[in-house]
């Protein structure tokens, strides 16, 4: 019996087609992805093949103005329209709190939404009961397939699930649910979830009875043969893990942003054992036409986005200096504003010992593309912020050793004075440079804001200590020459859309007046 698994993950609000780098589509003839194009390909496969499941491994939420405006209603609407068979909860599905998951998505989805390792307690338990499930048995042709879900247990540090959801260890939570499926005579079981490729592989290895793992969170690109675009494969598709009980378990992921549709064909024997698995992600490029009905619907929904982008988010009573002349040479108040917003967006009081789990932000000055003049009645709009942060990136959470941070700050000024983009703006950090010293030895003082303290204060950076830092995904991926961050980071979790972070902060503060306050000094 043959099953076709179509899968997406980490779509992050890319409902419209995008450029090849998953930013806003500029030249339509070269654009990719989007739900209208995805639907065309899915329907083509559904017509051609008998047993097809369309699955999503989480993080539909967060990433573009679509999510800012529609807050998840767009996810439910278009996933319903594409007739997804199941979805696993990702960490970003909790970005607007549990209510922001229940109302727009859980109550509106016409497909099961899954996670076996999230347990509700207190008053939430009855409110959310039945709205998401640990597993679902789906009829496919003449057979049944069990889908069991899982979600990153780091979600409380990455999003806003509140205090009434407990995120258990994935493997511990999955095993009894898989065992239950076995007692129900379900012998074909897919683990669908959002904990990253390393955990996907562990699940394949450790959870008895799981036949296939369809993952997300780490934006992993797997491919067999010559890859069709810019993404470099982390391994073959599917990635085969040998389980502890000796089975060959295929593990798949489909990069991110709806650029690819994962396509995996599995052959099962009559006892539900995987005999063979093969496939590849399908690049959703412009050779695949956009479905006219989904496209028409997208275009109807688009109008509210443009209206939103010109509305006032808040006011500034000071000039927001985002000029290259400032932000690439010295501390600039636009950099301070953005870093303050990044830290504010990551406030998670999850431990009495810590006022927060993260206190530090770094931001490449070259990523700040425009100032905002306060003389336009002080008004700040989404459109203004899109000029400041035009690249559609995310502000991510990483863990780095102090020694890596020191290297990053040396890199920040290694060729100072040439208006290059690597000059770092900061939050929760005090840095002093001596430009008379040779490159690579110019950081003379580097103090960082404590987290394990009731009164935050600045302490000298410790080289061997592991620190959490918020930074743009561009830096986490080694951009602007920050190769040491990419090479030495100990953990990397994708965060919220950059503009969304700053716009939410401005809306919250209502009136802003960021200053230049001595975060960056020259001796």
């Amino acid at each position: 019996w043959e099953l076709t698994i179509l899968h997406t993950n980490d779509v992050h609000s890319r409902l419209e087609q995008t450029s090849e780098d998953s930013s806003k589509c500029v030249n339509a003839s070269r654009c990719m992805g989007g739900v209208a194009r995805l639907f065309t390909k899915v329907q083509q496969i559904r017509r051609a093949e008998p047993n097809v499941l369309l699955l999503d491994a989480g993080d539909q939420y967060q990433g573009t103005i679509w999510f800012t405006v529609y807050k998840g209603a767009e996810v439910a609407h278009f996933m319903n329209a594409l007739r997804y068979d199941a979805m696993a909860l990702g960490n970003h599905e909790f970005d607007n709190g549990v209510e922001g998951l229940i109302e727009p998505l859980l109550k509106e989805a016409k497909f099961p939404i899954l996670s076996a390792n999230i347990k509700a307690k207190g008053p939430l338990a009855s409110q959310i009961s039945g709205l998401y499930l640990p597993y679902k048995v789906l009829p496919v042709g003449d057979e049944v397939v069990g889908i069991v879900g899982y979600t990153s247990k780091e979600t409380p540090f990455l999003s806003n699930p509140g205090t009434n959801l407990v995120f258990e260890d994935e493997i511990t939570a999955l095993q009894p649910e898989v065992d239950k499926l076995k007692t129900l005579n379900v012998n074909k079981i897919i683990a669908l979830g959002h904990s990253g490729f390393e955990m996907d592989k562990l699940i394949a290895q450790k959870v008895r009875g799981v036949d296939v793992v369809v993952g997300g969170h780490s934006n992993t690109f797997l491919y067999t043969g010559n890859p069709p675009s810019k993404e470099v494969p982390a391994g073959k598709y599917p990635f085969i893990v040998t389980s502890d009980d000796g089975r060959k378990v295929p593990v798949v992921q489909a990069y991110a942003f709806g650029k690819y549709l994962g396509y995996l064909k599995i052959e099962f024997d009559e006892r539900g054992n995987v005999i063979s698995s093969h496939g590849n992600p399908i690049l959703l490029n412009s050779s695949i036409p956009e479905d006219p009905s989904i496209k028409a619907d997208i275009n109807k929904w688009r109008i509210k986005l443009d209206n939103y982008s010109t509305q006032e988010l808040g006011k500034t009573i000071v000039y927001l200096d985002g000029s290259s002349q400032s932000c690439r040479f010295r501390e600039c108040n636009m950099g301070n504003l953005i870093c303050d917003a990044m830290i504010n967006n990551n406030l998670r009081h999850t431990d009495e010992m810590f006022w927060n789990h993260v206190s530090m932000c770094i931001l490449n000055g070259g990523g700040i593309r425009s100032p905002i003049d306060e003389r336009n009645n002080g008004t700040i709009t989404w459109e203004n912020l899109a000029a400041v942060l035009p690249f559609g990136g995310t502000f991510d959470l990483v863990q780095l050793k102090g020694s890596t941070l020191k290297k990053a700050f040396e890199h920040s000024v290694h060729r100072y004075g040439q208006s290059t983009g690597e000059f770092l703006q900061v939050g929760g950090i005090h840095v002093v440079y001596d430009l008379s010293r040779k490159p690579g030895d110019r950081v003379v003082k580097l103090d960082v804001l404590c987290t394990k303290c009731r009164v935050p204060s600045y302490d000298p950076l410790k080289m061997d200590e592991v620190y959490k830092v918020i930074l743009p995904n561009f830096l986490a991926n080694g951009g602007d020459g920050f190769q040491m961050i990419k090479d030495e980071l100990l953990r990397h979790d994708s965060g919220d859309q950059d503009i969304n972070v700053v716009s939410t902060y401005i809306s919250k503060m209502k009136v802003i007046y960021p200053a230049v306050e001595g975060r960056i000094k020259f001796s």
Epitope: R83, S293, K295, D297, K300, I303, K304, D306, T310
Partner: antibody, heavy 118, light 113 residues
Framework: QVQLVQSGAEVKKPGSSVKVSCKAS????????ISWVRQAPGQGLEWMGQ????????NYAQKFQGRVTITADKSTSTAYMELSSLRSEDTAVYYC???????????WGQGTLVTVSS | DIVMTQSPDSLAVSLGERATINCKSS????????????LAWFQQKPGQPPKLLIY???TRESGVPDRFSGSGSGTDFTLTISSLQAEDVAVYYC?????????FGQGTKLEIK
């Protein structure tokens, strides 16, 4: 209130081009699709294409692809429809219409009669 | 392309009587995202642009008298005028609001008997 005011009637020779304008007022011009729909004398309605002035995104009906050009000038809140290689069967009233979230055509211009005659 | 076919082509109804116009689409107009049907009805009087009466197959546009109602689902739709008034004499069009290219029915001419 939403108003769409179109340019006046035109008489054109076969093979020539015509450019009809549609000036919008009473709303944020950049934020709503504007469609062009034509109606030949005594005939039904035929959608030609649409533009989203905010970013210039355009969809054309296949039938008119290559012969129609829809543009928008945000500075004057005006949409334009240019039809080239005119033939007698292009004689029609040409309407612009603004969409809303619930429907493509809740607001219409008054129409522009284009007569193609030698 | 979705083809919209109206019936009848013309219709004569007495004042105060019920008028019914049918519209059939070549493909389903059901929007699976919200389970509504993407169909609109327009009224056009001579020398005037069309006027939106009904959207979503059954929702009346604001200001439209409640004698106008729309029904149907999938591929079969109906516009009903419960009690015909003199000012309702016009041509009525259904429209595929669902899929590009946006298409109209050929029109139904409503007259007073």
């Amino acid at each position: 209130q939403v108003q769409l005011v179109q340019s006046g009637a035109e008489v054109k020779k076969p093979g020539s081009s015509v450019k009809v304008s549609c000036k919008a007022s009473g709303y944020a011009f950049r934020s709503y699709w504007i469609s062009w729909v034509r109606q030949a004398p005594g005939q039904g309605l035929e959608w030609m294409g649409q533009i989203f002035p905010g970013d210039g995104d355009i969809n054309y009906a296949q039938k008119f692809q290559g012969r129609v050009t829809i543009t928008a000038d945000k500075s004057t809140s005006t949409a334009y429809m240019e039809l080239s290689s005119l033939r007698s069967e292009d004689t029609a009233v040409y309407y612009c219409a603004r969409m809303d979230f619930y429907s493509w055509f809740p607001y219409w211009g008054q129409g522009t009669l284009v007569t193609v005659s030698s | 392309d979705i083809v919209m076919t109206q019936s009848p082509d013309s219709l004569a109804v007495s004042l105060g009587e019920r008028a019914t116009i049918n519209c059939k689409s070549s493909q389903s107009l059901l929007n699976s995202g919200n389970q509504k049907n993407d169909l609109a009805w327009f009224q056009q009087k001579p020398g005037q642009p069309p006027k939106l009466l009904i959207y979503g197959a059954s929702t009346r546009e604001s200001g439209v008298p409640d004698r106008f109602s729309g029904s149907g689902s999938g591929t079969d739709f109906t516009l009903t005028i419960s009690s015909l008034q003199a000012e309702d004499v016009a041509v009525y069009y259904c429209q595929n609001d669902h899929s590009y290219p946006l298409t109209f029915g050929q029109g139904t001419k409503l007259e007073i008997k």
